[in-house]
């Protein structure tokens, strides 16, 4: 079964920029990557960057820089101010589109000890949806 | 299917603005984001921006930045683009095109004139 | 801002000949993390919208006829139409599809010789 792991970090040179990674376990081909907050995409959650593999990536704020770190990884800078910035207790989703299994997502917040600079390792994250 | 409709001219005074209308039919419109983009006889395609109606947020060409303002209205599944203090080099054909450019509007014909 | 420059600004061909435009960047449109190349072309017939042609420099879109080929990296790119049909003539152009803002080469008309 394909897994979605969720990383969200805090960074600690400024408190209210955040990285997130997700990555794809499975042996599809990715077709597309949806980053979003607040919920998962087409739940509540908005969409912060979308990721084809061979279209290129489109983010909107507050995301500031999102990339391939792998063919089945990404991750995404979010940097904030006011009421566009992430808290510490906001949730990241991932939805990875993959052929032939089909959509998988998976979220994940800040662990709640974190410590400015700080992260959980990335392991599997709950899958929320397969569509 | 998917399309894009546009009205066809807008003949418009020098210094006055124009808000442009790009109604999308055949999917969520929400999941989506629309561009922008200005051709000019002689002078290519030019992208304006792009905006996602799901958040309302819109990212700019920095060239347009002070020229066009991009707004959605998710009721009616249509995107917006306003031009503001316009002149005779604002007079251009303007399309709207979802997602990674693969569905495209016909364009409004935009033409600036006393 | 990434610029693309296209040459030849004008192509004539005869029918059933092979047609080659030329696309470079100013920085390299290969994305490091999953080896894939982001430039797009497009085709615009007059009076017509442009119509996504290649993406991913080599990625023919679905319903475009094998005779458009992409190729090229980093910087360097080429759409090359193997056997020239009339239906062919229009404006070609190359598209970052890299980075913001999303720049276009100047375009290339291609006509018949």
């Known amino acids: 079964t394909p897994e979605v792991w969720v990383q969200v970090r805090m960074e600690a040179t400024e408190l209210s920029s955040f990285t997130i990674r997700c990555g794809f376990l499975g042996s599809g081909s990715i077709s597309l990557v949806t980053v979003s907050w607040g919920g998962p995409n087409g739940a509540g959650g908005t969409t912060l960057a979308v990721l084809h593999p061979e279209r290129g990536i489109r983010q909107w704020a507050p995301a500031r820089q999102a990339r391939w770190e792998t063919q089945s990884s990404i991750s995404l800078i979010l940097e904030g101010s006011g009421a566009s910035s992430p808290c510490a207790n906001t949730t990241f989703c991932c939805k990875f589109a993959s052929f032939p299994e089909g959509s998988w997502e998976a979220c994940g917040s800040l662990p709640p000890s974190s410590d400015p600079g700080l992260s959980a390792p990335p392991t599997p994250a709950p899958i929320l949806r397969a569509d | 299917q998917v399309q894009l409709q546009q009205p066809g001219a807008e003949l418009v005074k020098p210094g006055t603005s124009v808000k442009l209308s790009c109604k999308a039919s055949?999917?969520?419109?929400?999941s989506y984001w629309i561009n922008w983009v200005k051709l000019r006889p002689g002078q290519g395609l030019e992208w304006?921006?792009?905006?996602?109606?799901?958040?309302?947020?819109?990212n700019y060409n920095e060239k347009f930045k002070n020229k066009a303002t991009l707004t959605v209205d998710t009721s009616s599944s249509t995107a917006y683009m306003q031009l503001t203090s316009l002149a005779s080099e604002d007079s251009a054909l303007y399309y709207c095109?979802?997602?990674?450019?693969?569905?495209w509007g016909a364009g409004t014909t935009v033409t600036v004139s006393s | 801002d990434i610029v693309m420059t296209q040459s030849p600004d004008s192509l004539s061909v005869s029918l059933g000949e092979r047609a080659t435009i030329n696309c470079k960047s100013s920085q390299s449109l290969l994305s490091s993390g999953n080896q894939k190349n982001y430039l797009a072309w497009y085709q615009q017939k007059p009076g017509q919208p442009p119509k996504l042609l290649i993406y991913g420099a080599s990625t023919r879109e679905s319903g475009v006829p094998d005779r458009f080929t992409g190729s090229g990296s980093g910087t360097d790119f080429t759409l090359t139409i193997s056997s020239l049909q009339a239906e062919d003539v229009a404006v070609y152009y190359c598209q970052n599809d890299h980075s913001y803002p999303y720049t276009f080469g100047q375009g290339t008309k291609l006509e018949i010789k």
């Open positions: 095109a979802g997602g990674y450019f693969d569905v």
């Open positions: 304006i921006g792009d905006i996602y109606p799901g958040s309302y947020i819109p």
């Open positions: 055949g999917y969520t419109f929400t």
